[in-house]
């Protein structure tokens, strides 16, 4: 390893960073996550912590730019120099800049998150096999409704997993139409449009009307970008592939290397290359933003290039899915900042007397293997007709299931998960949920189908929480998490994306812990979680009984309700209230009788 002359380094350990702008290549949440994971590599082996802030006085300002982008070091277009970073110090020092002429991915092709289908929002897998053919972009093949879709595994024919790609026929973004899909054709300034347009705008954004007549209804949305089929180079850079297209009299419904000697994939950007001669290169594997960021952050922390070819700080990009940090990187960063301190030795814990009633006999917790079936919003798979539009989420469309005794919340022994959402208590069980508002004579409403309101979710949930500021809903099931903002979902993501190790089999609950912070629980352990960064602080790991003496050690759900913490075990809860920094159990009761006010018959 090498460090900069004078061992340039930060002289405080709580480093802040600001993501000043974004690349269009990846969803913002994926970019946020890539940077958070890149910082986590370095914090895992040093005393450093990294906190995301939202102002330019952050230590490390992260910026995407092209060519001359405001410093003395212009970028060089696609490939070559991918990014650069400045050694630690004030002002621009310590900042990291990423060349947005690159295709940013996670190293394995464009990241296209899907919606609906049966893949729980997983990203497309490019290339994928469908009916024996290879596809390197989303396709409408096999469908009659024109909706682009992709396989989320390498082979649709064998795995049958798919989702719908971003498409204006499925939804729009922003605008004023609540995300409704485009209506084609539509009238704008007396003219008919059968595709998204930039007309009427000076910023180049593609938009459409969501009714047949924009002039009359004034309802519109922006068309989602399609990273998988946005071409580079050629003579139509930035335009979309048009599938199918005709080349030398033959029809192509995916990118092709025909007519080229170098094997590079290309497509036409009109339906007929032979007549229009408009084309561009299809996206390649791209560069892993996570790996490049991890390297750049090494520089921003004071590491120069390493001469060890396997090291992250070696000056050549190399995609790897293994652990990025080499011993040489660890030695280098520890030379500057020292090792991560060991957790303080804990005094032997004395067992806190448990409340005597009710009994503490309980199941060991929910099974970690979940039913394989997933509710599908939309078609069960391409080909065939699909949704005319995404199912709309919201109370008004929630389907009430015909009532049977088991569908009465008062007959549910143990709920999968409980959460306060808005001002109501939501109770989840086996693909269904109930809503409860406290009040004299109140009864839980429902059951409703989870699939109607949150179509991406599995039937079995371990825990749920709402972050009040952003109104984001976090749903945990096994080793996965889904984050809903209104009707749009990010996920599923693995728990390790949140900084939780492979030894964490599930998240069993969450409690608020200050502005934008939560405590996440898993069995006997808990972590502090930053909602904006969507990362746990790995050093905040603690034992539940240290912070909440007197609660059972094998709770299967932890939730907050009316500003108090509830620890569920079997049919019972232990309620904890905080007084002057002390967490004390102040009530033990039954979920059904004491919270839901069910009759004791």
């Amino acid at each position: 390893f090498q460090t900069f002359e004078g061992d340039l380094k930060w002289h405080h350990h709580n480093i802040t960073y600001w993501i000043q702008n974004y690349s269009e290549d990846l969803p913002r949440a994926v970019i946020d996550d890539a940077f958070a994971r890149a910082f986590a590599l370095w914090s895992a082996v040093t005393p450093l912590t990294f906190t995301r802030v939202y102002s330019r006085d952050a230590d490390i300002v992260i910026q995407f730019g092209v060519a001359e982008h405001g410093d003395g070091y212009p970028f060089d277009g696609k490939d070559g120099l991918l990014a650069h970073a400045f050694p630690p110090g004030p002002g621009i020092q310590g900042d990291a800049h990423f060349d947005d002429d690159e295709l940013w991915s996670l190293g394995k092709g464009v990241v296209v998150p899907t919606r609906f289908g049966n893949a729980d929002g997983a990203a497309c897998h490019f290339p994928f096999i469908f009916e024996g053919r290879s596809y390197s972009a989303c396709t409408t093949d096999g469908r009659s409704d024109g909706l682009p879709w992709c396989s989320t595994t390498a082979n649709y024919d064998t795995d049958d997993r798919f989702g719908f790609c971003p498409s204006e026929r499925l939804y729009t973004q922003d605008g004023n139409a609540d995300g409704k899909p485009c209506q084609f054709p539509f009238i704008f300034q007396g003219q008919s449009y059968s595709a998204c347009t930039t007309d009427g705008r000076s910023d180049g954004y593609r938009w459409c009307a969501t009714t047949a007549n924009y002039d009359r209804d004034k309802l519109f949305g922006f068309c989602p970008t399609r990273a998988d089929s946005t071409v580079m180079g050629g003579n139509s850079a930035g335009e979309l592939c048009v599938f199918p297209f005709t080349f030398l009299g033959k029809e192509y419904s995916t990118c092709t290397s025909e007519g080229r000697g170098d094997g590079r994939l290309w497509c036409a950007t009109t339906s007929n290359f032979d007549s229009d001669k408009k084309w561009g290169f299809c996206p390649d594997q791209g560069y892993s933003l996570f790996l490049v960021a991890a390297h750049e952050f090494g520089h921003a922390l004071g590491l120069d290039h390493s001469s060890v070819p396997e090291a992250l700080m070696y000056p050549m990009y190399r995609f790897t899915e293994g652990p990025p940090l080499h011993k040489d990187d660890v030695n280098g960063i520890r030379h500057l900042y020292g090792p991560r301190p060991e957790p303080e030795p804990r005094p032997p814990t004395t067992t806190t007397p448990q409340p005597t009633a009710p009994p503490t006999v309980c199941p060991t917790g929910p099974p970690t293997v979940h039913p394989s079936e997933r509710p599908t919003a939309g078609p069960t798979g391409p080909p065939s007709a699909g949704p005319t539009g995404p199912p709309t989420a919201g109370p008004s469309t929630a389907t009430t299931v015909p009532l049977s005794p088991v569908d009465d919340a008062c007959n549910v022994n143990i709920f999968d998960a409980i959460a306060e959402i808005g001002n109501q208590l939501y109770l989840f069980k086996d693909g269904k949920y109930w809503r409860f508002s406290e009040g004299r004579g109140s009864r839980p409403q429902g059951p409703f189908l989870i699939a109607d309101k949150w179509p991406a979710l599995p039937r079995k949930l371990d825990s749920v929480f709402e972050e009040r500021l952003s109104k984001k809903l976090f749903f945990f099931s096994g080793r996965q998490v889904w984050v809903y903002t209104g009707a749009s979902v990010l996920g599923p993501r693995r728990l390790d994306k949140l900084g939780l190790g492979a030894d964490v089999a599930q998240v069993t609950g969450a409690l608020r812990s200050g502005r934008g912070k939560m405590l996440l629980f898993s069995g006997r352990r808990l972590w502090r979680f930053d909602v904006k960064a969507q990362m746990v602080d790995p050093r905040s790991a603690s034992e539940v009984d240290r912070m909440f003496p007197g609660v059972p050690l094998d709770t299967h759900d932890v939730f907050q309700y009316r500003e108090k913490a509830y620890f569920c075990q079997d049919r019972f809860y232990w309620r904890v209230s905080s007084r002057s920094e002390l967490n004390q159990v102040d009530q033990v009761g039954y979920v059904t009788y004491d919270i839901l006010q069910c009759p004791e018959d």
């Epitope: 410093d71 003395g72 070091y73 650069h84 970073a85 621009i92």
Partner: antibody
Framework: EVQLLESGGGLVQPGGSLRLSCAAS???????DMWWVRQAPGKGLEWVS????????FYADSVKGRFTISRDNSKNTLYLQMNSLRAEDTAVYYC?????????????????WGQGTLVTVSS | DIQMTQSPATLSLSPGERATLSCRAS??????LAWYQQKPGQAPRLLIY???YRATGIPARFSGSGSGTDFTLTISSLEPEDYAVYYC?????????FGQGTRLEIK
């Protein structure tokens, strides 16, 4: 030992062309940004052009569209093709090597310079 | 473009004296500044980079300081071989620019 050796200068008429070369040795040429800097007689230094290892080029406004920088990494040689020469292009032309390379940035300066080659544009 | 202004244009000092050369940028350039020495008929030679780091082989009597817009090159005790023209150069913003130079002559 790092060495940079320019050649190709001389007397040329306005509107004429010249091609300067800079032969490099003693370092991994292909990894470094390489620059041309000129100095008019009795005047200060003025940057002319730079080429990155990837081949990306940048030019001073005064020479844009007339000069072309290039490199041949297999021959460890930097070039400057000068067309449509003007009297004000008269100068000693130096090639220079960046002290640092790659993606970490401090202003590290030009740590090695050639001895310079004189270009005189006159009728 | 960022303008680099050096002062004084000429500095006359005797051997053994302390020389202080100034360079001012028209806007902040952080510490992205280099100093060069040029003797007649020779190519420039890098003295200081990143405002304060001595280049390889440069004697300890040369030092650089400053950040933002104001920078100083100091020669603590002048030797006969130090008489030359000194240039500052910025790379805090594109394009790079040089100062017009300070001539250091024997008094």
């Amino acid at each position: 030992e790092v060495q940079l050796l320019e050649s190709g200068g001389g007397l040329v008429q306005p509107g004429g062309s010249l091609r300067l070369s800079c032969a490099a040795s003693g370092f991994t040429f292909s990894q470094y940004d390489m620059w041309w800097v000129r100095q008019a007689p009795g005047k200060g230094l003025e940057w002319v052009s730079v080429i990155y290892p990837s081949g990306t080029t940048f030019y001073a406004d005064s020479v844009k569209g007339r000069f072309t920088i290039s490199r041949d990494n297999s021959k460890n040689t930097l070039y400057l093709q000068m067309n449509s020469l003007r009297a004000e292009d008269t100068a000693v032309y130096y090639c220079a090597k960046d002290r640092a390379y790659g993606d970490y940035v401090g202003w590290n300066g030009f740590d090695y310079w050639g001895q310079g080659t004189l270009v005189t544009v006159s009728s | 473009d960022i303008q680099m202004t050096q002062s004084p244009a000429t500095l006359s000092l005797s051997p053994g004296e302390r020389a202080t050369l100034s360079c001012r940028a028209s806007q902040s350039i952080s510490s992205f500044l280099a100093w060069y020495q040029q003797k007649p008929g020779q190519a420039p030679r890098l003295l200081i980079y990143d405002a304060s780091y001595r280049a390889t082989g440069i004697p300890a009597r040369f030092s650089g300081s400053g950040s933002g817009t104001d920078f100083t090159l100091t020669i603590s005790s002048l030797e006969p071989e130090d008489y030359a023209v000194y240039y500052c150069q910025q790379r805090g913003n594109w394009p790079i620019t040089f100062g017009q130079g300070t001539r250091l002559e024997i008094k």
